[in-house]
């Protein structure tokens, strides 16, 4: 099929006839078919989260009434351009990104609401938001300022091996340095009980008569 | 590196057709918008058509409306131009050009000669 | 359509002096989508400047770019012999995607 041509609109306009409030009226309503550019917004700055996931809203300001919207996230480092992922949507339905893609996304009107997933610290950058109104004719491209997304690695989690080894150690020691102490202690204690003496015992009176009991004298060599 | 080389150009009569080709190579075809801009003879740059990314869209000037058709093979990397009721007005050096991902005209093939003359 | 205008036809000047170069739109055009090329006789056009003001990759500083709205300028701070050419504008921010007529900058 060959290529169809662009509609043209031209206001014919006479403003002489109109008084001051009319034509202040007049541009203020037509504004947006003189400047025909489309702008987009989007936040400076974005943190990922801790996952590696950065969240942003992209909105257009559209020159004309597209029934079918491009959006592409552009990641731009050292004057290279490289495309992160992109999405066609018709006017009305779901914003809706190839299934490998690291985007996701959801539009309601002239808004998207964007997400990527598995950011890593190098991929810490402006992202930028293109817009292209790709149809009906003519078509629009709308370029948003950037977001610097910023991307913290976490703490990588240690090997779960590596820590039963810690754990193991750990507790090793723990055990020795107890089982050591106790040896200590008790070689300490049998000292303090067993004093140097000759060996002979002396019968004692008994403390208590009716308790009393016969105790014959005994030797306990001492090596 | 970015390389688009045209091919098909030459000498035809007024009302036939011809079939241009550019074959590109040294970067993701589908990503890009790929036009095709004249330049007749001693004149200025006028843009004739663009087809964007998958095909499924594809804008062209009010000069050629009807009378040219842009396509593009995405798995063989190439875009077409195929130009039917050809006029005298239509004799150029016709460029395939790469629309950058910003938008603006980054890469140009060397350009194919095209004369409608009986 | 968006028609782009370009001031002066011709520019003559010797190597060493400044050029100025002027591109008027019939409505305004934001800079993200303005740029400049520059055409060699039997060579296809090159990028010079993208978003009205910023370098393409390999393009020396003396040419620079400038304007917004309706008006904008190219800059050729000194001109060596090789810049000797015609150069045009352009904007890609809606379709038809239009360029300026040219200005053909020539030895003095």
């Known amino acids: 099929m060959a290529c169809l041509g662009f509609q043209r609109h031209k206001a014919q306009l006479n403003l002489a006839t109109r008084t001051w409030p009319c034509t202040l009226l007049f541009f203020l309503l037509f504004i947006p078919v003189f400047c025909k550019a489309m702008h987009v917004a989007q936040p400076a700055v974005v943190l990922a989260s801790s996952r590696g996931i950065a969240s942003f809203v992209c909105e257009y300001a559209s020159p004309g009434k597209a029934t079918e919207v491009r959006v592409t996230v552009l990641r731009q480092a050292d004057s290279q351009v490289t495309e992160v992922c992109a999405a066609t949507y018709m006017m009305g339905n779901e914003l809706t990104f190839l299934d490998d893609s690291i985007c996701t996304g959801t539009s309601s009107g002239n808004q998207v609401n964007l997400t990527i997933q598995g950011l890593r610290a190098m991929d810490t950058g402006l992202y930028i938001c293109k817009v292209e109104l790709m149809y009906p004719p003519p078509y629009y491209l709308g370029i948003g300022n950037g977001t610097q997304i910023y991307v913290i690695d976490p703490e990588p989690c240690p090997d779960s091996d590596f820590l039963l080894w810690i754990l193991a150690a750990v507790s090793s020691g723990l055990f020795f340095y107890s089982f050591l102490l106790t040896a200590v202690s008790l070689s300490k204690m049998l000292k303090k009980r067993s004093p140097l003496t000759t060996g002979v015992y002396v019968k004692m009176p008994p403390t208590e008569p009716e308790c009393e009991k016969q105790f014959q004298p005994y030797f306990i060599p001492i090596n | 590196q970015v390389q688009l080389v045209e091919s098909g150009g030459g000498v035809v009569q007024p009302g036939r057709s011809l079939r241009l080709s550019c074959a590109a190579s040294?970067?993701?075809?589908?990503?890009?918008?790929m036009h095709w801009v004249r330049q007749a003879p001693g004149k200025g740059l006028e843009w004739v058509a663009v087809?964007?990314?998958?095909?499924?869209?594809?804008h062209c000037a009010d000069s050629v409306k009807g009378r040219f058709t842009i396509s593009r093979d995405n798995s063989k990397n190439t875009l077409y131009l195929q130009m039917n009721s050809l006029r005298a007005e239509d004799t150029a050096v016709y460029y395939c050009?790469?629309?950058?991902?910003?938008?603006?005209?980054?890469?140009w093939g060397q350009g194919t000669l095209v004369t409608v003359s009986s | 359509e968006i028609v782009l205008t370009q001031s002066p036809g011709t520019l003559s000047l010797s190597p060493g002096e400044r050029a100025t170069l002027s591109c008027r739109a019939s409505?305004?055009?934001?800079?993200?989508?303005l740029a400049w090329y520059q055409q060699k006789p039997g060579q296809a056009p090159r990028l010079l400047i993208y978003?009205?003001?910023s370098r393409a990759t390999g393009i020396p500083d003396r040419f620079s770019g400038s304007g917004s709205g309706t008006d904008f300028t190219l800059t050729i701070s000194r001109l060596e012999p090789e810049d000797f050419a015609v150069y045009y504008c352009?904007?890609?921010?809606?379709?038809?995607?239009?360029f300026g007529p040219g200005t053909k900058v020539d030895i003095k």
């Open positions: 978003g009205a003001s």
């Open positions: 409505q305004s055009v934001s800079s993200s989508y």
């Open positions: 087809m964007w990314y998958d095909g499924s869209n594809k």
């Open positions: 352009q904007q890609y921010g809606s379709s038809p995607f239009t």
């Open positions: 050009v790469r629309g950058e991902l910003l938008g603006y005209f980054d890469n």
């Open positions: 040294g970067f993701t075809f589908s990503s890009y918008g």
